[in-house]
């Protein structure tokens, strides 16, 4: 297993609709054809997997149908979007990149993007 540098923004504020996007960029030492991207969330010292996708270079990322993540790739950059976020989802979102094929296997883990989320103000009750 060889190490690889992964860069991501330090802080992002999600939109009022609970959507946060950020780029995860990796310094690929070679010509990988199969890449796996995993988003991990760290909060209160606990790390949980948010979503993961494996893609062939030049193809779209495919997350599971029920995933809260979507993404696109361009060269050594992956543009990740996480949807359906609420204030309680505020935390450090870490991008993990694995170059699966061809060998050798490379692993890179970013420092994390602190995503802040604020729940939208409830609409005032209207009289009908």
């Amino acid at each position: 297993c060889k190490a690889m540098h992964v860069a991501q923004p330090a802080v992002v504020l999600a939109s009022s609709r609970g959507i946060a996007s950020f780029v995860c960029e990796y310094a690929s030492p070679g010509k990988a054809t199969e890449v796996r991207v995993t988003v991990l969330r760290q909060a209160d010292s606990q790390v949980t997997e948010v979503c993961a996708a494996t893609y062939m270079m030049g193809n779209e990322l495919t997350f599971l149908d029920d995933s809260i993540c979507t993404g696109t790739s361009s060269g050594n950059q992956v543009n990740l979007t996480i949807q359906g976020l609420r204030a309680m989802d505020t935390g450090l979102y870490i991008c993990k990149v694995e170059l699966m094929y061809p060998p050798p296997y490379y692993l890179g883990i970013g420092n994390g993007t602190q995503i802040y989320v604020i729940d939208p103000e409830p609409c005032p009750d209207s009289d009908f």
């Epitope: 802080v11 504020l13 989320v117």
Partner: antibody, heavy 117, light 108 residues
Amino acid sequence: QVQLVQSGAEVKKPGASVKVSCKASGYTFTSYGIGWVRQAPGQGLEWMGWISAYNGNTNYAQKLQGRVTMTTDTSTSTAYMELRSLRSDDTAVYYCARVRGGGLDVWGQGTTVTVSS
Amino acid sequence: EIVMTQSPATLSLSPGERATLSCRASQSVSSSYLSWYQQKPGQAPRLLIYGASTRATGIPARFSGSGSGTDFTLTISSLQPEDFAVYYCQQDYNLPFTFGPGTKVDIK
């Protein structure tokens, strides 16, 4: 080195607007946020809100909602805070600070805004 | 919003003494998002401690932070003349971020 440099002192009349700038250097501007904090004479620190330089999204303190606008110009690594309909109790030193998630680690030198008729 | 309170409002001590400053949050705050700042007259605040217990770059070892949940403490083990200032705690766990009212450490 990492630093934030703010615009100079301003004297404004009640009802006017003020726009304070905060120029960042020494780091990747879009990787962080810029927060704004003010301090009235002899008082403590008051959080005004912040802007994510990465995507331009903002979050403002409730009491300033509708009067404050925070923006960034990523081409010049500069953040701006505009406060409208100024009142005498807006007289304060206004600070910008880098938001990184876990502390405001770099602060501007402060901009004194005086509201007086 | 999370309301931060600090005690005491003023702490009068002599150089060389130990200072213990308290900060309480109105609801639980992850320790990763609790910071302490020092402010001297006419100067901008300076980050001392982040993550409740990690000293910021260049901060002397006499400053230490501890605590979790709703109760946090800043300790200055042996006060130096340059340590007499106002100290603020702040949370950036929930939006909006909020500061405590400050504790003034002055010379007895």
